[in-house]
């Protein structure tokens, strides 16, 4: 998977948008979409977005998860949808690569 | 059915220290983070400290930092807040509460109320 | 820190009334807000999370929305059983309660 990475002038997808970035819309549309999961205070805060450039999410997106934030990318229209991001559980590696799916 | 009992409360000098208990029970405990609000009689809510699934991770606000501790054993399905250098201002009513990842502080305790007064 | 206020401070109104209690956030909060419902001498009990979704067990009655800085919650016929104090809480940043809505029958 890591070998199959996107050209900076690929095709646009359209993403799910939910959290602080998106102002009043439900979606948005970018080079790679992603869904988070945040500690904030021992709160957990979850969103979803879009990459507008490939470069800005490719180091975001393949950062392990870490006891404080994970994120989960992937490629597709809607491709989102129904990923929630997880922490990591005792005991579990999580290679960057685990964390990107392409559609 | 998730059940969360606080105990520990009781009246205190300025000064002095106090440790609070919440045992909880109808739920696989070390799966979800734990907190600790307080309410001051006749006053609103504060959230006080959170405390991650291990215990590795806490987090307080300024106004505890430095004094108050969150702690929790898994083995006994215990979370604990141990309080120091205690100021007329923490007399209040301290709630333990339990959030799903989904739904931050759904289920609560009943309380226990700590007076710091000299 | 993110400050919440709500209003009215204090409400009264009728049984069967359409009831309308606001939160208001100092910054963008998006949907990160909760609501509670505390009757005198018990704990707060959750209504509402994540601005609009209504917790297991709450009558259909209750309902929130709102988005970014704004939010109200919403009891469609009031019930004697309803009168209580509500308070908003953000988690987005800084976790902070509102400093409570007191509602009371007319």
């Known amino acids: 998977v890591e070998d199959e990475k996107p050209k900076v002038n690929q095709k646009l997808y359209m993403c799910v948008c939910e959290g602080l970035s998106c102002g009043n819309e439900d979606h948005c549309e970018g080079q790679q979409c992603f869904s988070s999961l945040s500690i904030n205070d021992g709160f957990h805060v979850y969103q979803k977005g879009c990459f507008q450039v490939y470069e800005q999410g490719k180091m975001t997106c393949k950062t392990p998860p870490s006891p404080g934030q994970a994120v989960e990318c992937c490629q597709g229209d809607w491709c989102n949808r129904n990923i929630t991001a997880q922490l990591p559980t005792k005991g579990k590696s999580f290679p960057g690569t685990q964390n990107f799916h392409l559609e | 059915e998730v059940q969360l009992v606080e105990t520990g409360g009781g009246l205190v000098q300025p000064g002095r220290s106090l440790k609070l208990s919440c045992v909880a029970s109808g739920f696989t405990f070390s799966n979800y983070y734990m907190y600790w609000i307080r309410q001051a009689p006749g006053k609103g809510l504060e959230w006080i400290s959170s405390?991650?699934?291990?215990?590795?991770?806490?987090y307080y606000p300024d106004s505890v930092k430095g004094r108050f501790a969150i702690s929790r054993d898994n083995a006994e399905n215990t979370v604990y807040l141990q309080m120091n250098s205690l100021r007329s201002e923490d007399t209040a009513t301290y709630y333990c509460?339990?959030?799903?990842?989904?739904?931050?502080?759904?289920?609560w305790g009943q309380g226990t109320l700590v007076t710091v007064s000299s | 820190d993110i400050q919440m206020t709500q209003s009215p401070s204090l409400l009264s109104a009728s049984v069967g009334d359409r009831v309308t209690l606001s939160c208001k956030a100092s910054q963008n909060i998006y949907k990160y807000l909760n609501w509670f419902q505390q009757k005198l001498g018990e704990a707060p009990k959750l209504l509402i999370y994540y601005s609009n979704s209504l917790q297991t067990g709450i009558p259909s009655r209750f309902s929130g929305s709102g988005s970014g800085t704004d939010f109200t919650l919403t009891i469609s016929s009031l019930q004697p059983e309803d009168v209580a104090i509500y308070f908003c809480f953000q988690y987005s940043s800084g976790p902070t309660f509102g400093p409570g809505t007191k509602l009371e029958l007319k």
């Open positions: 405390i991650n699934t291990d215990g590795g991770s806490t």
């Open positions: 509460a339990k959030s799903t990842p989904n739904i931050p502080l759904a289920y």
